[in-house]
């Protein structure tokens, strides 16, 4: 199967909604619950999510929602909102009509002729919006995550089943399987499907083996496969890297701790705009790369790679992806150059002058055997002990 094409939207940001919403087969999600398989039912209406009407909520709809979200069936009907709607009484005869307001503010309903998501449809303005909201608790709490990959969109694949997080065996694990994971998590498309030991091995059960997705499934548990077998160990835990994952490198410097800042995002390496490349952004990057702190931000060169990323950090973030970011935003990046940084752990600092020890210094570790004292963040003058 060919990789799916990247989404059309080039101008995206950390503040925007996911590329793929959780309930692709049925435009529904559960919010404000104890897990992804319980809570208030919301349906998607064009660009927004609206709470579903409780007055028309029934066991068929509840069952369909739980199945569509990969959460098993619905729990007993007693767990659902009672059928009697908490609505004001009908207006007295002769009262002025409120129909226009009621319709404009009307709540959507999820109406199902059976307990299967294909038999459901969302009907707009089906209820007055002052009524009770639909809620459901599903029988089986299923979830998916990527762990130990430096972000939510890369790492070892783990499924939550029967209350326990467990791995997926890498036998037959390929890009189609990883596509399903990435799409389900709202992480775009799969850049890599990785075999065991690319990420730290998991613990606990192995929930799946011989996974064989077509790539079109909305949920990993919809893919053909076998229950995890005993002969599959954690050294074979499957992993994935998705297009929305960001990883960074410094290029063109003396070592990996100096150079032009580049971010791998949506399958390619991109440069970073220096229009807001301040000490706080440089600090976050150096620390996340294990390169100490930022010493200097040299003047950059014109952008040479395909995309441009812009970051705005407060300096306390663990990685740049935790900062506010924008991708291919021409307004922010039009006059920019490609950001560069020199981190304190770079060996290019070793060849510089060694003045007397300043009175006030900051100590950082470069390598296990070398300690560096830095007088000033913007200075290259230091003392090697």
């Amino acid at each position: 199967h060919p990789s799916p094409a990247p989404p059309d939207q080039l101008n995206t940001s950390s503040a925007e909604s996911e590329l793929w919403e959780p309930g692709e087969r049925l435009p529904v999600r559960l919010t404000n619950g104890s897990s992804s398989c319980s809570g208030t039912v919301e349906v998607r209406l064009e660009a927004s999510w609206e709470p579903a009407c409780g007055a028309l909520w029934d066991s068929r709809a509840a069952e369909a929602v739980c199945r569509a979200l990969g959460c098993g069936g619905a729990e007993a009907a007693s767990q659902l909102a009672p059928p009697t709607p908490e609505l004001p009484p009908p207006p007295a005869a002769g009262n002025t009509s409120v129909a226009a307001n009621a319709t404009l503010a009307g709540a959507p309903a999820l109406l199902c002729s059976g307990a299967e998501w294909r038999l459901c449809e969302v009907v707009e303005h089906a209820c007055r919006s002052d009524g009770r909201r639909a809620r459901v608790t599903c029988a089986e709490n299923r979830a998916l995550r990527l762990v130990d990959g430096g972000g939510a969109c890369a790492g070892r694949v783990e499924m939550l089943e029967h209350g326990e997080w467990g791995s997926v065996c890498d036998d037959t694990w390929d890009l189609e399987d990883a596509h399903v994971v990435c799409r389900q998590l709202g992480c775009g498309w799969a850049v890599q499907a990785l075999p065991g030991l690319h990420f730290t091995p998991g613990r606990g059960p192995i929930h799946r083996d011989q996974v064989n997705c077509s790539g079109a499934e909305a949920y990993l548990w919809d893919c053909p496969g076998l229950p995890g077998q005993h002969y599959c160990g954690h050294k074979e835990d499957a992993g994935a890297v998705c297009s929305e994952h960001q990883s960074w490198r410094l290029t063109g410097g003396a070592d990996r701790c100096e150079g032009q800042v580049e971010v791998h995002f949506r399958g390619v390496w991109n440069t970073v705009c220096d229009s807001e490349w301040y000490p706080s952004e440089a600090k976050v990057l150096c620390q996340s790369l294990g390169c100490g702190t930022a010493v200097e931000r040299p003047k950059g060169l014109p952008h040479s790679l395909s995309g441009r990323m812009y970051y705005s950090c407060n300096g306390e973030e663990l990685t740049l992806s935790n900062c506010s970011w924008r991708f291919n935003n021409s307004n922010l990046c039009s006059q920019s150059l490609a950001a560069r940084v020199l981190c304190s752990a770079s060996r290019s600092l070793h060849n510089l002058s060694t003045p007397e020890v300043p009175a006030s210094v900051q100590t950082v570790t470069i390598e296990s055997s070398v300690t560096v004292k830095i007088e000033n963040k913007e200075s290259r003058e230091l003392m090697l002990l």
């Epitope: 028309l56 009908p90 319709t103 009907v123 303005h125 209820c127």
Partner: nanobody
Framework: QVQLVESGGGLVQPGGSLRLSCSAS????????MGWFRQAPGKEREFVAA????????YYADSVKGRFTISRDNSKNTLYLQMNSLRAEDTAVYYC????????????????WGQGTLVTVSS
Amino acid sequence: QVQLVESGGGLVQPGGSLRLSCSASERTFSDYAMGWFRQAPGKEREFVAAINWVGGSTYYADSVKGRFTISRDNSKNTLYLQMNSLRAEDTAVYYCVASWGAMPVLTHVINYWGQGTLVTVSS
């Protein structure tokens, strides 16, 4: 109190058409979502079609989708059900219903029921 009076029922051959009407006494007819239920001899009452306050949203039972059309004229306080391609299994008493809180898809939200009009589909 809303009075609902159905009309338009009768005998029709399979494949034929009928148009049911439901006239409402209430001046605030447009404050109610409306719908049709039916009950065949010896069977339970079942949902047929519903329409919201101003007619912007409709919903149909799978068994009538593509054959029946629900509509309303708020200026005339009247609800309609256009029934085409009628089948023997459509034979039933058809009830007009009104609901203030939600489209009358489930019986528990219905505030008012009409007396019903009989539709017989037979050759």
